[in-house]
């Protein structure tokens, strides 16, 4: 085979036209990406065959391998083929596109692989990076193939600079399978036991008929061997189980228990491990913080949650003001303790449509024969404020007074404001705040009382207006953490009988 130009590497201009010729003693054909592009085939008078491939209006996407091979059924040597690599430097093409297959690289052993990020210009400097890092990796680069080396099980990107623009390739993902057609799972009846209790572990293999189990465990290292029992789970095909049973555990039995399984047919092996903790005695431990003051809003439902660790499983009791709580038949209180993992628990007290009487001192106690823990908090019921009364009066002194009374929990703040221009205020003009000590025309007197039985504050505030010369809209606003309420009254001068 004779190729002209001979290559093996050509650099062609973008938008140009280029002609490749291949000739041989038998029919020849040009191939590009496993396909035959349109080409002109001919046979000369001297019996020589040729094929002419004309590349027109070249772009960066024409970069790549071109092969000339014999196109003959006479069974000529298939390795008789010529390879040509063409670059078409094109600033509009960063990295050449990859097929999906090329973005995922799968392997079962440590072997050299190629991350096939390729550019259109052989002069460009290309670097390889882990997707999550900026440091360039010291891996050799071949402009025709990409980066070749031994890669870890990570994701990688290639970078280059075209002009003043940094360009990133697609991400390439290397998947390395630690070969094992044995599927082993290990579990324990309990991973936490008290000394004197039993440790029982099971190692199960699926999909194999002949396997060998080997256990390693803390007791084995001190030369005290335990004989495992192996059985077949007949209700499931090819499920084999090895049971390791250690009666009357000691503190020294804490540690890692490993089940190693081998099968000699394909020389496969797999292992799984589990940690066992032997404790001297049981425990109960609170997890996380719960503030000593908790809040609930009147008539809303509230769930109070305590998270703790315990072994063995504890008894959980809730108290209010030292009286034991239970699920109420009316559905006002719900208690639940959930086991969210082997030794972790969540206990919840739910108050449905909270009432004032449910404020008080709450305690959760979790206990068993070895340990106990308790957690207490005060529950405050927050009550949205409401203005109960807003009244205006004309004492003989000539001044005019407005009295505002309201209740809520926590203690409400009171804000007095007035609109002097009834037509424009409050839509166009903001109300004027009243009761500032600097103002001579109004004086304010506020008293606060805590009502123990209702567990809320009452605020009574009296606003004294020295001289009112035209109608005035006076507004009393009460505000606390869970709401606000407003009422207003029109105050008229003495000289204007209100109609």
């Amino acid at each position: 085979l004779v190729v002209t130009p001979p290559g093996p590497e050509l650099v062609l201009n973008v938008s140009s036209t280029f002609v490749l010729t291949c000739s041989g003693s038998a029919p020849v054909v040009w191939e590009r990406m496993s396909q035959e592009p349109p080409q002109e085939m001919a046979k000369a008078q001297d019996g020589t065959f040729s094929s002419v491939l004309t590349l027109t209006n070249l772009t960066g996407l024409d970069t790549g391998e071109y092969f000339c091979t014999h196109n003959d059924s006479r069974g000529l040597e298939t390795d008789e083929r010529k390879r040509l690599y063409i670059f078409v430097p094109d600033p509009t093409v960063g990295f050449l596109p990859n097929d999906a297959e090329e973005l995922f690289i799968f392997l079962t052993e440590i072997t050299e692989i190629t991350i096939p990020c390729r550019v259109t210009d052989p002069q460009l400097v290309v670097t390889l990076h882990e997707k999550k890092g900026d440091v360039a990796l010291p891996v050799p680069y071949d402009h025709q193939r990409g980066f070749s080396g031994i890669f870890e099980d990570r994701s990688y990107i290639c970078k280059t600079t075209i002009g003043d623009r940094e360009v990133d390739s697609d991400a390439y993902y290397v998947y390395r399978l630690q070969v094992s057609s044995i599927n082993v799972s290990v579990n324990a009846v309990q991973t936490v036991v008290r000394q004197g209790e039993n440790i029982t572990l099971m190692c199960i293999v699926i999909g194999n008929e002949v396997v060998n189990f080997e256990w390693t465990y803390p007791r084995k290292e001190s030369g005290r061997l335990v004989e495992p029992v192996t059985d077949f789970l007949l209700d499931m095909p090819y499920h084999i189980r090895s049971i390791l049973h250690i009666p009357s555990a000691e503190l020294e039995d804490s540690g890692t228990y490993t089940c190693n399984v081998t099968e000699s047919v394909n020389d496969h092996q797999d292992e799984k491990a589990i940690n066992i903790t032997v404790v001297e005695s049981g425990y109960v431990r609170l997890l996380g913080e719960v503030g000593t003051l908790q809040f609930a809003e009147l008539h809303r439902s509230r769930t109070l949650q305590v998270v703790f660790e315990a072994y063995p499983p504890p008894t959980v009791l809730w108290f209010k003001d030292n009286r034991t709580l239970g699920d109420s038949s009316a559905g006002e209180i719900a208690l639940s303790t959930r086991n969210v993992s082997e030794t972790r628990y969540v206990s919840e007290l739910t108050l449905v449509r909270v009432k004032v009487a449910e404020a008080g001192h709450y305690t959760m106690r979790a206990f068993h024969e070895d340990a106990e823990v308790q957690l207490s908090f005060q529950l405050q019921i927050n009550v949205p404020v409401r203005v109960l009364e807003l009244s205006e009066s004309h004492p003989d002194s000539g001044e005019q007074t407005v009295r505002c009374r309201g209740r809520g929990m926590p203690q409400p703040n009171i804000i007095w404001s007035a609109c002097r221009d009834l037509k424009r205020c409050p839509r166009e003009l903001p109300p004027t705040l009243l009761g500032n000590s600097s103002e001579e025309e109004s004086q304010l007197e506020t008293n606060v009382t805590y009502w123990e039985e209702e567990q809320e504050f009452e605020v009574v505030s009296t606003l004294r207006l020295q001289h009112v010369d035209r109608p005035l809209s006076v507004r009393c606003t009460l505000r606390n953490a869970v709401g606000q309420d407003t009422q207003e009254v029109i105050v008229v001068p003495h000289s204007l009988p209100f109609k």
Epitope: K132, D153, R154, V174, Y175
Partner: nanobody, 116 residues
Framework: QMQLVQSGAEVKNPGASVKVSCKAS????????IQWVRQAPGQGLEWMGW????????HSAQKFQGRVTMTRDTSISTAYMELSGPTSDDTAVYYC?????????WGQGTLVTVSS
């Protein structure tokens, strides 16, 4: 800890579809593509295709197009691969895998034996 757990071994007659499941845990299921790969006895790994668990989009290798269907049930964080019209050449261990960026995670593999 990211984990993929596959369904158990299957023995199928030629032509009878096989469906393998892959349950994910320890990470947000929709965050990473699921790849399906197989290894026939004595052969290397062969990529079959990927599934985007977020959108349900799939892309399969040319060799398997029209024969492999990849689906998912996000409510139970499980991906499925169904191979239709299998022949004895499809006897292999089928793996699901995902990549967390810093490393790959694999299911334990499901042995599918196609034999009459």
């Amino acid at each position: 800890q990211m984990q993929l757990v596959q369904s158990g071994a299957e023995v199928k007659n030629p032509g009878a579809s096989v469906k393998v499941s892959c349950k994910a845990s320890g990470y947000p299921f929709s965050a990473y593509y699921i790849q399906w790969v197989r290894q026939a006895p004595g052969q290397g790994l062969e990529w079959m295709g990927w599934l985007n668990p977020n959108s349900g989009d799939t892309h399969s290798a040319q060799k398997f197009q029209g024969r492999v269907t990849m689906t998912r049930d996000t409510s139970i964080s499980t991906a499925y691969m169904e191979l239709s019209g299998p022949t004895s050449d499809d006897t292999a261990v089928y793996y699901c895998a995902t990549h967390g960026g810093d490393r790959s995670y694999w299911g334990q593999g499901t042995l599918v034996t196609v034999s009459s």
